[in-house]
């Protein structure tokens, strides 16, 4: 009998409200033995895969997805999923990334000003949908 795969978790560092032009890292976590972590954006058709998986603890593995310079277009809902042969896990909860105007001044990143975004309720996806394996050799639209 195949093992039940635990749901992955997702977090963002340093947080979920990021100044325009600053960097953010999404951290996906799952059990040991994960081969591929996938960070999905808004829908399953937009994602990034990585096999750069490290062991976070004796029982957990993790992958980090970094955006070096956050733009307004990076705002949205993100979630994680992983592939532990021979199957894919279910999705993590959604995490919402908000982009805020940087505080300004001569030392701020050289980026176009964006609209200020206040904190919002982070939606959660508790569905248990099956996730079809990614087609080898095909790549959906990249996240960034």
């Amino acid at each position: 009998q195949e093992e039940d795969l635990p749901r992955p978790s997702i977090s963002a560092e340093p947080g979920t409200v990021i100044p325009l032009g600053s960097h953010v890292t999404f951290v996906c976590r799952g059990p040991v033995g994960v081969q591929t972590f996938r960070l999905e954006r808004d829908s399953r058709s937009t994602y990034n895969d990585t096999e750069d998986v490290s062991q976070a603890s004796p029982s957990e593995s993790e992958a980090r997805f970094r955006i070096d310079s956050v733009r307004e277009g990076n705002a949205g809902l993100y979630r994680c999923i992983y592939y532990k042969p021979p199957k894919w896990s279910e999705q993590s909860d959604y995490l919402e990334l908000l982009v805020k105007e940087s505080s300004g001044g001569p030392d701020s990143p050289d980026t176009e000003p964006g609209s200020s975004a206040g904190p919002t309720q982070r939606p959660s996806d508790n569905s248990h949908n099956e996730h079809a394996p990614a087609s080898q050799g095909l790549k959906a639209e990249h996240l960034y």
């Epitope: 977090s11 560092e13 947080g15 600053s22 001044g105 990143p109």
Partner: antibody, heavy 118, light 108 residues
Framework: EQSVEESGGGLVAPGGSLTLTCTVS????????MGWVRQAPGKGLEWIGY?????TTFYASWAKGRFTISKTSTTVDLKMTRLTTGDTATYFC??????????????WGPGTLVTISS | ELVLTQTPASVEAAVGGTVTINCQAS??????LAWYQQKPGQPPKLLIY???DLASGVPSRFKGSRSGTEFTFTISDLECADAATYYC??????????FGGGTEVEIK
Amino acid sequence: EQSVEESGGGLVAPGGSLTLTCTVSGFSLSNYHMGWVRQAPGKGLEWIGYIYTHGTTFYASWAKGRFTISKTSTTVDLKMTRLTTGDTATYFCARGGYADYNILYNLWGPGTLVTISS
Amino acid sequence: ELVLTQTPASVEAAVGGTVTINCQASQSISSYLAWYQQKPGQPPKLLIYDASDLASGVPSRFKGSRSGTEFTFTISDLECADAATYYCQTYDSSTTAAFGGGTEVEIK
């Protein structure tokens, strides 16, 4: 009023273990990340790690393996093992999440002193 | 591993004067830098975050700025109550969380 308070400090022999407890009131641990920071006598602040709202933990590289953070609905524990004299310090529990940043701390406990000595 | 180098280790200034503290990051941390004040026997108090934004209730005598990976913290119109140790901290990531070594400010 919102507050955090550490307890469980004291004298421990080298090689021993100790669990510190941070008790929170006035807010929910399901809404805030909680961190641990320590300060050796007369020295600077040293970040240990934190526990995310949903229970995921992150640690400083030097703390991995010997320090474990866990939580209940109203407390956050720091379990320390294989203690050495270099672990002698005041241990602070702090609430993260200021300006929505995980490890930006604006609410701290008074600290609890841990002394490692034979 | 990221290192925050804070200078000077100690500084003395007169009431009404100005003190400047520097914090150099060994790698890029964007503007993810905070400044804390700590008085003897007390926990730290958050003063500034995002390099230059004042935390709630902090007077405008406290100011922070950033130039690349170098951060500056200034206290103007010094008061006796400002005598304390000040720390910079990066909250960039759990892989790079760090505090500077601290600067003790004495008021003459």
